[in-house]
Amino acid sequence: LIIGFGISGRHSITVTTVASAGNIGEDGILSCTFEPDIKLSDIVIQWLKEGVLGLVHEFKEGKDELSEQDEMFRGRTAVFADQVIVGNASLRLKNVQLTDAGTYKCYIITSKGKGNANLEYKTGAFSMPEVNVDYNASSETLRCEAPRWFPQPTVVWASQVDQGANFSEVSNTSFELNSENVTMKVVSVLYNVTINNTYSCMIENDIAKATGDIKVTESEIKRRSHLQLLNSKAS
């Protein structure tokens, strides 16, 4: 969480941003809130990106003003126009690119004054893993697959029964480049698994951490997955 203050004459307004991550090829949100104003026509929102001379986005007098928008963002940005009046200056970024990573500034001008705050935006690829029993293998084997990751993640296996055990000797992980030549499919195989145990496949890079759990008993198989963005925490 980054809170910025700005001074305009005697007045400053508080602007708050939250670091976040974008999943390339999908839509992302750059979060920014500010002290609201009574009149929408008095609010100006400017989004800037470090090292880029054109604007990322501008909203003023109740509508988008994109004449000064940098071409790398053309057609890809939008604010939540109906929420500006309540202090939401967050930016929706369509079709996130790897090159969208960087430091952004949310700059606000209202009748009360002006203020700004920066946010770090990371880009990469992350997806939920799925763990399955590989019935084609000669021994009891688990297969963990996640379709899209970038940068290349680490994969670690863990077990509820054998806590602290190192499974690197009995697992094999491969990374297969996807058709767009950036993201990769992650496949990790764990051998010699035992029943009545819960195994976890943990995939992590500097943007996200995802875990796929599988509980194998004689009568059933239970699966659970979750994904956590690492850099959207308060800072």
């Epitope: 054109g54 000064e68 790398m72």
Partner: antibody, heavy 121, light 107 residues
Framework: EVQLLESGGGLVQPGGSLRLSCAAS????????MHWVRQAPGKGLEWVSA????????YYADSVKGRFTISRDISKNTLYLQMNSLRAEDTAVYYC??????????????WGQGTTVTVSS | DIQMTQSPSSLSASVGDRVTITCRAS??????LAWYQQKPGKAPKLLIY???TLQSGVPSRFSGSGSGTDFTLTISSLQPEDFATYYC?????????FGGGTKVEIK
């Protein structure tokens, strides 16, 4: 010490080409947008071109668009201006300058000493 | 393109005088304005950015004000080393544009 040092100026005939270089030192080169600004003899300052920190975006004045190309080599900490189809009105002292801060809204805080380009037959 | 009109184009003043230079943008540039000082044969020097923020190392007798389209550079008490040409420049929109300059001469 933060420094910019231009080179590559000289006398060239109309229609000719020159490549100006600007060696940067004392700061993290790839986090700053960089500019070329020129000043014709006895005249004011004219913005010529700029390049984003990553080098991914370039910007030109209408008077040089299609003839000049700005680029940067981050491994060499050097900014370039390739000038083709030069005209007499391109005669000027050319300065490279660093954009202050991390965003585009501030001025140019570090300037080189300038290199002179003379276009004449 | 945004036009920057500076006035006066030249002025004569004495040491100790209060000097005011104005700059007008053809449309709103908020506070995206810088002021520079240039002496003959030298590169420009940044004095003020963001319309009113004094650049590090610049004497406090220099000040800037304004927003939108009208801006002012003030030298509260002119010193011998301040005789130079002053330029405003907008960085709101590419192409960046400079004012025509104001030459401050000794009366």
């Amino acid at each position: 010490e933060v420094q910019l040092l231009e080179s590559g100026g000289g006398l060239v005939q109309p229609g000719g080409s020159l490549r100006l270089s600007c060696a940067a030192s004392g700061f993290t080169f790839n986090t700053h947008a960089m500019h070329w600004v020129r000043q014709a003899p006895g005249k004011g300052l004219e913005w010529v071109s700029a390049i984003s920190g990553s080098g991914g975006s370039t910007y030109y004045a209408d008077s040089v668009k299609g003839r000049f190309t700005i680029s940067r080599d981050i491994s060499k900490n050097t900014l370039y201006l390739q000038m083709n189809s030069l005209r007499a009105e391109d005669t000027a002292v050319y300065y490279c300058a660093r954009l202050l801060g991390r965003f585009g809204e501030y001025g140019m805080d570090v300037w080189g000493q300038g290199t002179t380009v003379t276009v004449s037959s | 393109d945004i036009q920057m009109t500076q006035s006066p184009s030249s002025l004569s003043a004495s040491v100790g005088d209060r000097v005011t230079i104005t700059c007008r943008a053809s449309r709103s540039i908020y506070t995206w304005l810088a002021w520079y000082q240039q002496k003959p044969g030298k590169a420009p020097k940044l004095l003020i950015y963001d319309a009113s923020t004094l650049q590090s190392g610049v004497p406090s007798r220099f000040s800037g004000s304004g927003s939108g389209t009208d801006f002012t550079l003030t030298i509260s008490s002119l010193q011998p080393e301040d005789f130079a040409t002053y330029y405003c420049q907008q960085s709101y929109s590419t192409p960046y544009t400079f004012g025509g300059g104001t030459k401050v001469e000794i009366k």
